[in-house]
Amino acid sequence: QGGAAEGVQIQIIYFNLETVQVTWNASKYSRTNLTFHYRFNGDEAYDQCTNYLLQEGHTSGCLLDAEQRDDILYFSIRNGTHPVFTASRWMVYYLKPSSPKHVRFSWHQDAVTVTCSDLSYGDLLYEVQYRSPFDTEWQSKQENTCNVTIEGLDAEKCYSFWVRVKAMEDVYGPDTYPSDWSEVTCWQRGEIRDACAETPTPPKPKLSK
C-alpha cells in the first residue's frame, strides 16, 4: 500500500464503504505522537484527524467518516510541522466489506441453503466454506448475493460452516480485504450442533480375503 517514506509503513482499510482507517508504523518515530492531516478534494485545505488510534500511548492511526465515497484520500503524516509521509490513494480499492449478518441455514435432505443480509452495495461475492471432520480442507462455494445452496452433503456427517464477503477483483482491484468470517456453526442431520468431532471415527479395517 505504497512505499515507505522515512521508514513509515502505512495500511489503509475502507470498512464497508463507511469508515476509512489509516494506520502507520514508523520505527523512527515510535515514541512520537505523529499527526494525521487529510482532505478528500485536492483543492481543499487539510483537516486534522479528530479520531486517532493509539498504540502504547502514541498515535498509530486515524479513523475517518467516509460514507459511500469513490474518490481520493489525500493525506499527510507529520512530526510537528514536518511531513514524514504524504500520499494519495483511491479509498475504494482498499475496501473491506462487513462480516455477514443474520446468517441462516435452510436444509432440504442433502442440500443446505445459506442466506444472510445482503450488503448495500454491489460487485461482491458471498463465500460459504464448509467441511466435515472427514475433509482435509475446506470446500467453498460463492455467489453474487447471500443466497448460496450447497448440494451433495451427507446427512449423517457433521459439517462446520462459515461465511464471508469479498470484493470482486475485476471491479475493486487486487488490494481489497475479505470481510471477517462469520462465526462457525456446526450442523448434522439438519440440526445445529455445538461442535463437530475433530477426529472422525476411523473406518473399520477391511478384512483381507
Epitope: D71, L119, D123
Partner: antibody, heavy 119, light 107 residues
Framework: DVQLQESGPDLVKPSQSLSLTCTVT?????????WPWIRQFPGNKLEWLGY???????NYNPSLKSRISITRDTSKNQFFLQLNSVTPEDTATYYC????????????WGQGTLVTVSA | DIVMTQSQKFMSTSVGDRVSVTCKAS??????VAWYQQIPGHSPKVLIY???YRFSGVPDRFTGSGSGTDFTLTISNVQSEDLAEYFC?????????FGGGTKLEIR
C-alpha cells in the same frame, strides 16, 4: 453540478470504428468516480458499455470486450469511447455519465448523441 | 447476465392517481436497483437508488421498494410532468443491466 457533453460523428460506415468524446466540466475526472458510456437503441433499450475509473482502470461489458476501448485525456478532462467493427446494430444514442464503484447507478448523464451506422 | 424484466410496456393513469411500475430480476440482486425517468427527448434521470433511496432533488411522491428479485416504483399523486418512460437497473454485479422500460401515459 458536474456536466457532461458527448461529441463525435453522427454517421459511421459499417466495419469502421465509432469514436466519441465526453467533455466533463465542474469536476475533474481524475478526482473520483467512474465515467461510463451507455447506449440507447431505437426502441429505447439501454445497455451499459463500460467505464473508466478516475484511477484509470477500465471495466467493459463482456458482450463488447473484443471491440471496445475507453480511454481519457486528463489534461482536457475528457474521456473517449472507441467501438470497432461496427454494424447497423450499433446504431444508437450514446450517453456518457458518472457513477461510483459499489453503487453503479448513473447519477449524471450527458444529453446523448445519436450515431447511425449505415453505408 | 442478469435480466431485468418490466412486464408492462405501457401504463395509463390520470393526474392525481397513484401508479406502481414493477421490475423483476432473473436472480437475486439484493437491494442494488435504481430507477430512472426519461422524459421524451431527454436523457434518463435517476429517481431511486439502492431500491428505496430517493436521489437528491427527487420529489417525495416517488418511492421505491423491494429486494431480492421484485422491485416497485410507486408514483403517488401523479402529475402531468410525470409523462415519461421509467427504467429499472441492477448494479449488484456487472455487466449492469436495465429493464426494457415502462411508458406512463396520462389520460
Amino acid at each position: 453540478d458536474v456536466q457532461l457533453q458527448e461529441s463525435g460523428p453522427d454517421l459511421v460506415k459499417p466495419s469502421q470504428s465509432l469514436s466519441l468524446t465526453c467533455t466533463v466540466t465542474n469536476y475533474s475526472i481524475t478526482s473520483g468516480y467512474s465515467w461510463p458510456w451507455i447506449r440507447q437503441f431505437p426502441g429505447n433499450k439501454l445497455e451499459w458499455l463500460g467505464y473508466i475509473h478516475s484511477s484509470g482502470r477500465t471495466n467493459y461489458n463482456p458482450s463488447l470486450k473484443s471491440r471496445i476501448s475507453i480511454t481519457r485525456d486528463t489534461s482536457k478532462n475528457q474521456f473517449f469511447l472507441q467501438l470497432n467493427s461496427v454494424t447497423p446494430e450499433d446504431t444508437a444514442t450514446y450517453y456518457c455519465a458518472r457513477s461510483q464503484l459499489g453503487l453503479v447507478f448513473f447519477a449524471y448523464w450527458g444529453q446523448g448523441t445519436l450515431v447511425t451506422v449505415s453505408a | 447476465d442478469i435480466v431485468m424484466t418490466q412486464s408492462q410496456k405501457f401504463m395509463s393513469t390520470s393526474v392525481g392517481d397513484r401508479v406502481s411500475v414493477t421490475c423483476k430480476a432473473s436472480q437475486s440482486v439484493g437491494a442494488n436497483v435504481a430507477w430512472y425517468q426519461q422524459i421524451p427527448g431527454h436523457s434518463p434521470k435517476v429517481l431511486i437508488y439502492s431500491a428505496s433511496y430517493r436521489f437528491s432533488g427527487v420529489p417525495d411522491r416517488f418511492t421505491g421498494s423491494g429486494s431480492g428479485t421484485d422491485f416497485t416504483l410507486t408514483i403517488s399523486n401523479v402529475q402531468s410532468e410525470d409523462l415519461a418512460e421509467y427504467f429499472c437497473q441492477q448494479y449488484n454485479s456487472y455487466p449492469y443491466t436495465f429493464g426494457g422500460g415502462t411508458k406512463l401515459e396520462i389520460r
